[in-house]
């Protein structure tokens, strides 16, 4: 077998802490093993001898989302005798070719998922819009934390709305999951929401939610 090709285009794909490392190319006559370093700076083997070009590292990174993880993808010949002891991977006494991934700091680098408008509550001329507080894969004392619990008031929502028939839009920013507006009776309103992390310098905003209108909501509830 020829010398295995080193992986390239190593990319972290992470949304709400669900985290996958992807790379290229598809292997021929060799396999990949991913190694990730923990807080103790030990290397741990993941996706051992895989022919995939991705590896789900969520269970490792959620152990401490404030740590900057290092990972590498090793290219291992299929026919060589390989042993891994959890610390290192050796082929005839030599480390196989590998490529380092960029550092990944989950709390800083995970993308925000698409928010969901959970409900509308009308109280006279006030309309309250509630954005669902989605669960993450981050745990504290054995319990999964919500996005709000993880990011606190650093998590905000940009809410864009318009009267159903109008093209004019208004935008508001809130650091809670609820937002109230004054409405006219009998008029439909449409809402679009984006999540954001105020303190972030990069990947600050989520994709936008689906646009939801109060009329659709009423018909959905069977009113």
């Amino acid at each position: 077998a020829g010398i295995p090709e080193k992986a390239f285009n190593l990319t972290w794909i992470s949304t709400d802490f669900k985290t996958i490392l992807e790379w290229q190319p598809k292997p021929t006559n060799y396999t990949y093993t991913v190694q990730i370093s923990d807080r103790s700076r030990n290397w741990k083997n993941k996706c051992f001898s895989t022919t995939d070009t991705e590896c789900d590292l969520t269970d490792e990174i959620v152990k401490d989302v404030t740590w900057a993880y290092e990972a590498k993808v090793l290219s291992v010949p299929r026919r060589n005798s390989v042993h891994g002891d959890g610390d290192q991977l050796v082929i005839h006494g030599e480390e196989p070719p590998f490529t380092n991934a960029p550092k990944f700091l989950p709390y800083r680098d995970t993308n925000l998922g698409q928010p969901v408008i959970q409900q509308f509550e009308q109280d006279g001329r006030k309309l309250n819009v509630v954005v669902k507080d989605s669960l993450t894969l981050v745990r504290k004392n054995g319990t999964f934390l919500t996005l709000r619990q993880v990011f606190g008031k650093d998590l905000g929502y940009i809410i864009t709305y318009r009267k159903g028939s109008s093209t004019g839009k208004k935008t508001n920013i809130t650091n809670t999951n609820e937002f109230s507006i004054d409405v006219e009776e009998g008029v439909s309103y449409c809402f679009f929401v984006q999540a954001m992390i105020f303190s972030r310098k990069t990947n600050q905003n989520s994709p936008g939610s689906s646009t939801v209108c109060t009329e659709q909501w009423k018909s959905f509830l069977g009113e």
């Epitope: 404030t66 550092k103 700091l105 709390y107 800083r108 606190g152 992390i197 303190s199 310098k201």
Partner: antibody
Framework: QVQLVQSGAEVKKPGSSVKVSCKAS????????ISWVRQAPGQGLEWMGG????????NHAQKFQGRVTITADESTSTAYMELSSLRSEDTAVYYC???????????WGQGTLVTVSS | EIVLTQSPATLSLSPGERATLSCRAS??????LAWYQQKPGQAPRLLIY???NRATGIPARFSGSGSGTDFTLTISSLEPEDFAVYYC?????????FGQGTKVEIK
């Protein structure tokens, strides 16, 4: 406006410990990183460690491992830095500073002078 | 631990002159680098974040550039209040580290 207010100056004997507090107001506390930075007289800035209160896991510079304890009380929005086995070279101004994880330190406390002298 | 090396240690310039301060990292920090100004008896003040973004209220004469391992802080035309010590700091994951500082003094 975010404010970080630190406890007052301390004079300590070599071998003892000091605990400095940093109370945050005017902004979110739990989800931001609080760092502790010190500056010896006439010297540069030295990052000691940091914590994100929601997670409670502190990280420290290697130099201070085993000697520094960084904690946070979410209920009072207060962070603490305790330094043990004090020596004369620990005489410095100790600052707390706030920043998002992997971000700059955008708000700073006023500093706490700790003098270690026999 | 990432080591940040600032140069020069001291920069002697006159008001109105251009100041160029350098910060080099021992390994790549992408763009996770900030610059601070500190005057005697005061806490540091954030000037530049994420390598090139000016913090709130910082005058346009301050600019930052660079990525990876080499970074520059430029003060286009020194004002009397700009004479101070400047520090770079990396935040590409804990432990954060600071450079040793560059003192900008009046010539």
């Amino acid at each position: 406006q975010v404010q970080l207010v630190q406890s007052g100056a301390e004079v300590k004997k070599p071998g003892s410990s000091v605990k400095v507090s940093c109370k945050a107001s005017g902004g979110t506390f739990s989800s931001y990183a609080i760092s502790w930075v010190r500056q010896a007289p006439g010297q540069g800035l030295e990052w000691m460690g940091g914590i994100i209160p929601i997670f409670g896991t502190a990280n420290h510079a290697q130099k201070f491992q085993g000697r520094v304890t960084i904690t946070a009380d979410e209920s009072t929005s207060t962070a603490y830095m305790e330094l043990s086995s004090l020596r004369s070279e620990d005489t410095a101004v100790y600052y707390c500073a706030r920043g998002g994880i992997g971000a700059d330190l955008d708000y700073w406390g006023q500093g706490t002078l700790v003098t270690v002298s026999s | 631990e990432i080591v940040l090396t600032q140069s020069p240690a001291t920069l002697s310039l006159s008001p109105g002159e251009r100041a160029t301060l350098s910060c080099r990292a021992s390994q790549s920090v992408a763009k996770w680098l900030a610059w601070y100004q500190q005057k005697p008896g005061q806490a540091p003040r954030l000037l530049i974040y994420y390598a090139s973004n000016r913090a709130t209220g910082i005058p346009a004469r301050f600019s930052g550039s660079g990525s990876g391992t080499d970074f520059t802080l430029t003060i286009s035309s020194l004002e009397p209040e700009d004479f101070a010590v400047y520090y770079c700091q990396q935040s590409d994951g804990w432990p954060y580290t600071f450079g040793q500082g560059t003192k900008v003094e009046i010539k």
